[in-house]
């Protein structure tokens, strides 16, 4: 019969023969032959291969370096890499999460629209009319101005995006 030019899924072509790939978590030791199957070896403790493969070396698990603010979010297995995330108050600088930076704080006049996570930074928004923020914070949203009316008070000083209104007593009508 004609030697194959293409192989099925989870196979590879070598020496005009289709050999089984090694399953995830194992690496190649010997290719198959007409009489023998592919020989594979399991990856070691800190290694992985996440696909059907013909690799002769397993990959090292990612190291979550605490000096870079990283910690393990999910421990690696023989078939998956370790997933790193950042310590509390920090977030990843890239999708690969190779290092961390401190969460950004929203300045006075801005409030937190979305609190930061291990993988995304704080999202700030300007406080709209009727709201203010007088602190620099990674958690605080814009607060609504105090309603003087509900306290039977009047506005003595208008609010801004950074300051609350100042309420005061209503002027008494003189008799």
């Amino acid at each position: 019969p004609e030697p194959p030019t293409a192989c099925r899924e989870k196979q590879y072509l070598i020496n005009s023969q289709c050999c089984s790939l090694c399953q995830p978590g194992q690496k190649l030791v010997s290719d198959c032959t007409e009489f023998t199957e592919t020989e594979c070896l399991p990856c070691g403790e800190s290694e992985f291969l996440d696909t059907w493969n013909r690799e002769t070396h397993c990959h090292q698990h990612k190291y979550c370096d605490p000096n870079l603010g990283l910690r393990v979010q999910q421990k690696g297995t023989s078939e998956t890499d370790t997933i790193c995330t950042c310590e509390e108050g920090w977030h990843c600088t890239s999708e690969a999460c190779e290092s961390c930076v401190l969460h950004r704080s929203c300045s006075p006049g801005f409030g937190v629209k979305q609190i930061a996570t291990g993988v995304s930074d704080t999202i700030c928004e300007p406080c709209p009319v009727g709201f203010f923020s007088n602190v620099s914070s990674a958690f605080e949203k814009c607060h609504p101005w105090t309603s003087c009316e509900t306290k039977d008070l009047v506005v003595q000083q208008a609010g801004t995006n950074k300051t609350d209104v100042v309420c005061g007593p209503q002027d008494r009508l003189r008799a």
């Epitope: 190649l28 030791v29 032959t33 399991p42 002769t56």
Partner: antibody
Framework: EVQLQQSGAELVSPGVSVKISCKGS????????MHWVKQSHAKSLEWIGV????????TYNQKFKGKATLSVDKSSSTAYLELARLTSEDSAIYYC???????????WGQGTTLTVSS | QIVLTQSPAIMSASPGEKITITCSAS???????LHWYQQKPGFSPKLLIY???NLASGVPARFSGSGSGTSYSLTISSMEAEDAATYYC?????????FGAGTKLELK
């Protein structure tokens, strides 16, 4: 008939190195990886590592890194285990073993007894 | 590494007696990667059972194996004199490959 023929017993002094051989016959040598196993009274059977006879890539048990070096000579269908800086702890029987893809170590060498003594 | 703990370490049995040797793994392993070897004094280990329950070529039917996860066992349904040997379990699930410390089976 598949055979793994190992070199003879060795009596060596501490601090030196020794190279044990394992000649495969009765099959295509490069079709199977060659594993090495240590057997001592203290630790029973310990896997040292494996060498891909076709690619020449060796994988070691971390415990034996720096102690053992695996190599092959395809032309003579022979695998080698070299042990460095020998101490009495290295006194043991060393086996080469061939693993079939469907089952584990199906053929073993007869073993090489290594005695390290001053 | 995966530690395989065999028990008992040593035992003696009379001909005809049923024998069970256990092998406990420190973490779960696939049953496809647990094997048993028999070794007699002065000889190399010999493959006895592969992939938990498959008898190697030429192994008598009185031998059987079972188990899953972290717990495996080897059974001899009726002990014979030639079965006196040391038995080792072995895992090929994770590198480094490891063996149990062995169970020495003696004839009473």
């Amino acid at each position: 008939e598949v055979q793994l023929q190992q070199s003879g017993a060795e009596l060596v002094s501490p601090g030196v190195s020794v190279k044990i051989s394992c000649k495969g016959s009765g099959y295509t040598f490069t079709d199977h990886g060659m594993h090495w196993v240590k057997q001592s009274h203290a630790k029973s059977l310990e896997w040292i590592g494996v060498i891909s006879t076709s690619y020449g890539v060796a994988t070691y048990n971390q415990k034996f890194k720096g102690k053992a070096t695996l190599s092959v000579d395809k032309s003579s269908s022979t695998a080698y285990l070299e042990l460095a800086r020998l101490t009495s702890e290295d006194s043991a029987i060393y086996y080469c073993a061939r693993r079939d893809s469907k089952s584990p170590f199906d053929y073993w060498g007869q073993g090489t007894t290594l005695t390290v003594s001053s | 590494q995966i530690v395989l703990t065999q028990s008992p370490a040593i035992m003696s049995a009379s001909p005809g007696e049923k024998i069970t040797i256990t092998c406990s793994a420190s973490s779960s392993i696939s049953s496809n990667y647990l094997h048993w070897y028999q070794q007699k004094p002065g000889f190399s280990p010999k493959l006895l059972i592969y992939r938990t329950s498959n008898l190697a070529s030429g192994v008598p039917a009185r031998f059987s194996g079972s188990g899953s996860g972290t717990s495996y066992s080897l059974t001899i349904s009726s002990m014979e004199a030639e079965d006196a040997a040391t038995y080792y379990c072995h895992q090929y699930h994770r590198s480094p490959l490891t063996f149990g410390a062995g169970t020495k089976l003696e004839l009473k």
